[in-house]
């Protein structure tokens, strides 16, 4: 049935591991190594094994992976063909490289986090181990011949001569049975003869399709070729014991002459094309740290030279139900903080000779956006913001507040859900942005939640640079400069003129430019100029000036 894509296109249900080999390869029994888990913050380690038919259940000690608790995957059962999506419209080809990049958002791509990976610890460096792959069952190549004698079935009267011949890989067996049926219908067996004929196949015929597994010894750096046959064969020059040809050098051809007493000359001449040494390949994590939260990059690296023909080396990866045939793969649009399993193998002339299984945990993702509950000014110099934290892991908050072109940012503890802003400027619009961040392989900032408020009004500051000048005997010209801080919505200048303690003039203008006429001559006057912002008056600027005697 079709996998149901999640919002990202990748299902998150538990999955059975799918055996990688998709070719009818010569190699039969292959045991996958335990899946080695690697966290990208740790030194990269991997388990790769050459393929041994005996090595069907390799255990990994938890101690070998930083004393991590064992991560068990159970019951890898029968494998279904990956379900494939319906062909969409052809896409425009781009310049091809040898790197496979696949976005998990494609229809029906099934790249499942490994079982149990939804409850992932926040602790970087956590590791886990996984159980081994099951071994592919070996299909027996023999045919069982069953002959039923003494049948007493009630059949129409007739005589039948039946000859049954079965060919096995060991010998030709002729079974001839003559059964005569009487007119009454009862069966009478007159003769029964089973004879083996001495004719044998040639060893060249018998072992025409022999397959081989290459087993690598990391100490000696030599291969053993295991011949997949059902009987103990003999090799010319005694080159094999127990169907194994030992001490084969990488990238060298070896010729083996195979014979057995069940077959005749000519012998089978088997050319062993020995693969490169296993340790010359290393599975490398090529993920860019900036993208490690949603991408996985894996690449086989040749870390030493060898003389084998690189054209004969092929690489395979399987991640979920996606199969790749490149040396390097990139998977995109993955879930952060999830473990994904990829199996890979390298083949030489279609013989598997090494493989690795990786469980890769994607990095912490960018935290989600905090949800602002309210954001307002409660006084002229104060504001308050409250919020709910994002769901995803994060380390701290950054709160920035911007007035006009000025920006101030604060680092806030992850446990805070409210912050009081102090020392704000009155009657000023503040734009606030709040985002969570996490320090992972790199710092990842979550989306910022935004809000704004305008602080309350306050008294404006004093006008300045006030001047009083006489324009005639009984007239004065009063000017001043606007206050530095208006602190309110409106703009109005007031002038009060007092003689003694008596208010003689009270004027209001849009600008601080007053012409005061018809004053009394030779009188002391007090001039008070102040700014009013619609809510509050400012501190007055006070100057004293006297009119002169009339000149007339």
């Amino acid at each position: 049935q079709s996998p149901t894509p999640s919002p990202t296109g990748l299902t998150t249900a538990k999955m059975p591991s799918v055996p990688l080999s998709s070719d009818p390869l010569p190699t039969h029994t292959t045991a996958f190594s335990p899946a080695s888990t690697f966290e990208r913050e740790n030194d990269f380690s991997e388990t790769t094994t050459s393929l041994s038919p005996d090595n069907t259940s390799t255990q990994v000690s938890p101690d070998s992976l930083d004393n991590a608790s064992a991560f068990n995957t159970t019951g890898v059962s029968s494998v279904q063909t990956p379900h494939l999506p319906t062909h969409a419209d052809s896409q425009t080809p781009s310049a091809g490289t040898d790197t496979q990049t696949f976005s998990g958002s494609a229809a029906n791509a099934k790249l499942n986090p490994t079982p149990g990976s939804n409850a992932i610890s926040d602790v970087p460096g956590e590791r886990s181990t996984a159980s081994t792959f099951p071994t592919d069952p070996v299909s027996p190549l023999t045919t069982t011949l069953s002959l039923a004698h003494h049948s007493s079935a009630a059949l129409p009267a007739r005589t039948s001569n039946t000859t049954i011949t079965a060919n096995t890989s060991d010998a030709y067996l002729n079974a001839s049975e003559t059964t005569t049926l009487s007119p009454s219908g009862s069966a009478v067996i007159s003769t029964t003869t089973i004879a083996t004929t001495p004719s044998k196949p040639t060893c060249d015929e018998k072992y025409a399709n022999i397959t081989v597994d290459y087993l690598y010894n990391k100490e000696t750096k030599l291969f053993t070729a295991k011949l997949n046959v059902n009987e103990n064969v003999e090799c010319g020059n005694n080159t094999c014991t127990n169907n194994e040809v030992h001490n084969l050098t990488e990238c060298k051809n070896a010729s083996v002459s195979i014979s057995h007493n069940s077959c005749t000359a000519p012998d089978k001449t088997l050319i062993l094309d020995v693969p490169p040494g296993v340790e010359k390949f290393q599975l490398h994590d090529c993920t860019q740290v900036e993208k490690a939260d949603t991408t996985i990059c894996l690449k086989w690296k040749n870390i030493e030279t060898f003389t084998c023909d690189t054209q004969n080396i092929t690489y395979r990866f399987q991640c979920g139900n996606m199969i790749f045939d490149n040396k390097e793969i990139k998977l995109e649009n993955l879930e952060p903080e999830h473990e994904y399993k990829c199996d890979s193998e390298i083949l030489y002339n279609n013989h598997k000779f090494t493989n690795a299984s990786k469980i890769i945990k994607t990095d912490f993702g960018s935290p989600g956006e905090p949800q602002i509950i309210f954001c307002r000014s409660e006084a002229a110099h104060q504001g308050v913001i409250t919020w709910n934290p994002p769901q995803r892991s994060f380390h701290n908050f950054t709160l920035c507040y911007i007035k006009e072109t000025e920006k101030d940012c604060l680092n806030l503890d992850k446990n805070l859900i409210k912050y009081d802003l102090q020392n704000l400027k009155p009657y000023t619009k503040y734009v606030l942005s709040l985002h969570a961040y996490i320090i992972a392989k790199v710092q990842r900032n979550g989306s910022a939640a935004m809000c704004h408020f305008t602080t309350k009004s306050a008294p404006p500051s004093q006008v300045w640079n006030m001047t009083v000048s006489m324009t005639s005997d009984n007239s004065m010209h009063v000017k001043c400069r606007p206050p530095r801080d208006r602190n309110g919505p409106h703009e109005r200048y007031h002038l009060e003129v007092e003689a003694g303690n008596t208010l003689v003039r009270n004027e209001s203008h849009k600008n601080c430019d007053f012409r005061v006429k018809d004053l009394q001559y030779s009188t002391d006057y007090t001039f008070k100029a102040y700014f009013h912002n619609g809510d509050y008056p400012g501190e007055p600027f006070i100057l004293h000036h006297s009119t002169s005697y009339n000149s007339k």
């Epitope: 998709s22 990956p82 062909h87 969409a88 781009s94 791509a109 092929t314 139900n321 279609n350």
Partner: nanobody, 126 residues
Framework: EVQLVESGGGLVQAGDSLRLSCAAS????????LAWFRQAPGKEREFVAS?????????HYGDSVKGRFTISRDNGKNTVALQMNNLKPEDTAVYFC??????????????????WGQGTQVTISS
Amino acid sequence: EVQLVESGGGLVQAGDSLRLSCAASGLTNPERRLAWFRQAPGKEREFVASIRWSGGPNTHYGDSVKGRFTISRDNGKNTVALQMNNLKPEDTAVYFCAAAVRLTAPLNFDTSYDYWGQGTQVTISS
């Protein structure tokens, strides 16, 4: 202009063999993959086999055809063949040849392929 033309389909008995051929023209990039997909009536398109055009033996098969089908290439003639042995009634489908010039997606997904042939009908009678 890229063209893929399939041939070799037909009606055969269960257990028989059939060989399909796909002639590719207009593909200039040697880095490409050719594949066979099939689609039975009322079913989704299914991956059958793929082969890389350059390099060593790099072939893949769908689980249902492993051991029975063999994909091969003839670079000189620009053709890809699918040898189908021991055919079963469930192999009845329209077989499509496909080519990918961007090797940036899983080889067993039809969305990974850029060019498609018209298809050839294969019918297996029991």
